[in-house]
């Protein structure tokens, strides 16, 4: 039977090394066996690359494409193939579809004056455009009370958050996670970091 795309590819870039495209077929598909996504920078003399997709679900395919040293004006031509049949053709501008990398190494340290110091790492090297563009959202939740949670927006440069222990329940176990957003690129939010857990206490 004929192969058809139900939901056309949606793509995001981490704006440093990788772009990811995801699409849905109209029936369960072995993505890696049946499909190929070709991509090429829209410039004379650019290489034509091929991405082998993987299954995310029965009929959902995802392709991770190495994309080197992205610059704002870059546009990629994308072509989705099933053998010799062109299923879909489109273009993708990484700078217009940024999903930042996930912040890393979230840790919690006791600090002076009954505060907790939450620290994490900026996922971009200093020379990358996004390094100085990121703002963060920190989610702090009580492990035993789903209604007890707080969201903090960190809009200053440093990847840190000071949290007064008194704003949390004493003796309760809390978990924190962090995600990033690049305002000037109108990005989507990054994935959440892995959670880190600690026991809150104060006198």
């Amino acid at each position: 039977g004929s192969v058809k795309v139900l939901h056309e590819p949606s793509c995001f870039s981490d704006y440093i090394s990788t772009s990811v495209c995801q699409w849905k077929m109209d029936h369960p598909t072995n993505c890696s066996a049946e499909l190929r996504l070709s991509y090429q920078l829209d410039f004379m003399g650019s290489e034509n690359h091929t991405c082998v997709p993987e299954n995310r679900e029965d009929s959902v395919c995802v392709c991770s494409m190495p994309i080197d040293d992205a610059v704002e004006a870059d546009v990629y031509q994308l072509d989705l193939w099933a053998g010799q049949q062109l299923l879909w053709s489109g273009s993708f501008q990484p700078s217009k579809h940024v999903k930042p990398r996930t912040p890393g190494n979230l840790t919690v340290h006791p600090n002076i004056s009954h505060t907790w110091l939450l620290m994490w790492t900026n996922p971009y090297p200093t020379e990358n455009h996004l390094h100085s563009e990121l703002t963060y959202m920190v989610n702090v939740s009580n492990d035993n009370d789903p209604e007890d949670f707080k969201v903090y927006n960190v809009t200053y440069m440093g990847p840190t958050l000071r949290l007064a222990a008194s704003t949390l329940k004493s003796g309760a176990s809390y978990s924190a996670r962090v995600r990033a957003w690049a305002q000037t690129y109108n990005s989507t939010w990054s994935d959440w970091s892995p959670s880190t857990t600690w026991l809150n206490y104060y006198e």
Epitope: L41, F43, M44, G45, S46, E47, N48, H49, P66, D68, V71, D74
Partner: antibody, heavy 117, light 107 residues
Framework: EVQLVESGGDLVKPAGSLRLSCTVS????????VHWVRQAPGKGLEWLGM???????DYNSVVKGRFTISRDNAKNTVYLQMNSLRAEDTAMYYC???????????WGQGTLVTVSS | DIVMTQTPLSLSVSPGEPASISCRAS??????LNWYLQKAGQSPRLLIY???RLQSGVPDRFSGSGSGTDFTLRIGRVEAEDAGIYFC?????????FGQGTRLEVR
């Protein structure tokens, strides 16, 4: 860090042969094309040819048939094999990496080839 | 092959003054025009690609314009470190071809 380093330049007699090497680091030869460009003493730049990431090659007609570009991915090295050399091939030979629109964003330091009897 | 012609072949500019170099292609090359600077004893360095896009790390006193067959490189305020030979290169068609070069002296 992206780097290209040429080697193999030498004094060679007319009609002789020479193989130049361009060893790269900081990028993959399967994803970027590499070009050879030469510059005769006190003169301008002349494009000789390129090897694409996929392995195919293109040449300038002035050297086609005499010069051959190849590569060894395992050694991260691109080669320029030069045969039937002439006095007018005397030049500094550069390898360079392709960027957007056939722009050459990283160049080696060059290796000098002198063809003289 | 596409012939690239640069003018002037040399110019002398005082620090802080502007400078301009023209490059003409023998046929339409759209916006596929790149500029390089080669300082004495060094390899060429990419300054501008695709007519007007500044290569990473290049000071914004450099700018490029044009399309089709006529292109211009401008330096807003020349500095001593800008001395060298400037080459234009067409990137529309193989073989790639370069202009003959323009020597900029900063006096």
């Amino acid at each position: 860090e992206v780097q290209l380093v040429e080697s193999g330049g030498d004094l060679v007699k007319p009609a002789g042969s020479l193989r130049l090497s361009c060893t790269v680091s900081g990028f993959s030869l399967s994803r970027y094309s590499v070009h050879w460009v030469r510059q005769a003493p006190g003169k301008g730049l002349e494009w000789l040819g390129m090897i694409w990431g996929g392995g195919s090659t293109d040449y300038n007609s002035v050297v086609k048939g005499r010069f051959t570009i190849s590569r060894d991915n395992a050694k991260n090295t691109v080669y320029l094999q030069m045969n039937s050399l002439r006095a007018e091939d005397t030049a500094m030979y550069y390898c360079a990496r392709t960027y957007r629109g056939y722009a050459l964003d990283y160049w080696g330091q060059g290796t000098l080839v002198t063809v003289s009897s | 092959d596409i012939v690239m012609t640069q003018t002037p072949l040399s110019l002398s500019v005082s620090p802080g003054e502007p400078a301009s170099i023209s490059c003409r292609a023998s046929q339409d090359i759209s916006n596929y025009l790149n500029w390089y600077l080669q300082k004495a004893g060094q390899s060429p360095r990419l300054l501008i690609y695709y007519t007007s896009r500044l290569q990473s790390g290049v000071p914004d006193r450099f700018s490029g314009s044009g399309s089709g067959t006529d292109f211009t490189l401008r330096i807003g305020r020349v500095e001593a470190e800008d001395a060298g030979i400037y080459f234009c290169q067409q990137a529309n068609t193989l073989p790639l071809t370069f202009g003959q070069g323009t020597r900029l002296e900063v006096r």
